[in-house]
Interface confidence: low
């Protein structure tokens, strides 16, 4: 029994001690508990805020909570303070004091903080009566980085992002003209061909039997060879010449189902598919 | 190292009113904060009135209205103006400069004492 209860006592101690870290470094008639001030060191980036957290471990009647800064002459500069309830800014009125709900805590914050506010501050209690002491709270540093300087730990997944979406703007903007190149290109395909077809083919008196007139009678498309240049011209291909049936070739387009005539022309009643020409329907479309 | 010499000490009546000065030698005062203490027979010295280097000041419920402290930097001397002086004000009043140093500790300084009532 008495072995169990035994280490309890010990536990108990231990934890007093873990909690009032202050009993041990303070003469033991202080009248008051150690402050904290946290974190012990912060690191924002220029123009953010910084804000650094004043805590008393207990809430005396009346006191004044100060907020310094301590200048490389080892001197104090009060930035601001907290007293009867009420806020009492400094000069600068970047540096804030807040009192938060609980009462023991108090936020002090520099609003945009600025390169040169790189330094070491504190928070101070002065005690009013009847415990008429002051205590200070353990430095804390601040650093203060360049904007310019603090992105580059943050760079290198912006600009890949920023290299992806130029990479796919460049393959959008690349197959839109390549989209677009095409259809100017089948755009003048079609117009050469088929301005021929509205007119009908080019009849040259050759001993061909005569278009079929009437409404079962399909028309004829006939391909000048000669007529698709696909060399890149900056004026509009001129009008075939007229018809030489001694100087005209033509292509031989072969569609399944209905052989067509032999290096003439090729009937659009037998459009049912399209097929390669064969090397040995003669000259093909494109030219070699 | 700071000196500070007080002066203005004297028996007042009740109701009667009273000006200390606490004079600091050197010329680094301003970056101290200025406190007024008092002392009374048997009892623990408490805090009258402070104020900081930037001009806030801080009194005790018992002076509040009654006291006024002020600072004048470019002589390097703080003031206690006593008004509507009590039987209870009777106490040995002490100048005190303030400040935190490099070690975060408290680095104060104190007058020699000046008797009121």
């Known amino acids: 029994m008495g072995s169990r209860r035994g280490p309890w006592p010990l536990v108990w101690a231990v934890l007093q001690l873990g909690w009032w870290p202050g009993w041990l470094l303070d003469s033991p008639d202080r009248p008051w508990s150690p402050l904290t001030f946290s974190p012990a060191q912060l690191t924002v980036q220029e123009g953010e805020n910084a804000t650094f957290t004043c805590s008393l471990a207990d809430i005396p009647d009346s006191f004044v909570l100060n907020w310094y800064r301590l200048s490389p002459r080892n001197q104090t500069d009060k930035l601001a303070a907290f007293q009867e309830d009420r806020i009492e800014p400094g000069r600068d009125r970047r540096f804030r004091v807040t009192r938060l709900p609980n009462g023991r805590d108090f936020h002090m914050s520099i609003v945009a903080a600025r390169l040169n506010d790189s330094g070491i501050y504190l928070c101070g209690a002065i005690y009013l009566p009847p415990n008429t002491q002051i205590n200070e709270s353990p430095r804390a540093e601040l650093s203060v980085t360049e904007r310019t300087l603090e992105p580059p730990t943050q760079s290198p997944s912006p600009p890949p992002r920023l290299s992806g979406q130029l990479q796919g703007l460049v393959i959008g903007v690349t197959s839109v003209l390549v989209g677009v190149l095409l259809l100017l290109l089948l755009t003048w395909v079609l117009a050469a061909v088929f301005p021929r077809a509205t007119r009908g083919a080019c009849v040259c008196g050759s001993e061909d039997e005569p278009l079929k007139e009437g409404p079962d009678a399909a028309p004829v498309f006939t391909l000048d060879y000669g007529e698709l240049d696909f060399q890149w011209r900056e004026k509009t291909p001129e009008p075939p010449a007229p018809c030489a049936p001694e100087q005209t070739e033509y292509a031989t387009i072969v569609f399944p189902g209905r052989p067509a005539s032999p290096g003439r022309r090729a009937s659009a009643s037998s459009l049912q598919g399209a097929q390669p020409p064969s090397p040995e329907d003669g000259p093909g479309l494109w030219p070699p | 190292q700071v000196q500070l010499v007080q002066s203005g000490g004297e028996v007042k009546k009740p109701g009667g009113s009273l000006r200390l000065s606490c004079a600091a030698s050197g010329s680094i005062f301003s970056i101290y904060d200025m406190g007024w203490y008092r002392q009374a027979p048997g009892k623990q010295r408490e805090l009258v009135a402070f104020?900081?280097?930037?001009?806030?000041?801080n009194y005790a419920d018992s002076v509040k209205g009654r006291f006024t402290i002020s600072r004048d930097n470019a002589k390097n001397t703080v003031y206690l103006q006593m008004n509507s002086l009590k039987p209870e004000d009777t106490a040995v009043y002490y100048c005190?400069?303030?400040?935190?140093?490099?070690?975060?500790?408290?680095?104060?300084?104190w007058g020699q004492g000046t008797q009121v009532g």
């Open positions: 104020i900081t280097r930037g001009g806030s000041t």
């Open positions: 005190n400069a303030d400040r935190v140093g490099a070690t975060m500790r408290r680095v104060s300084y």
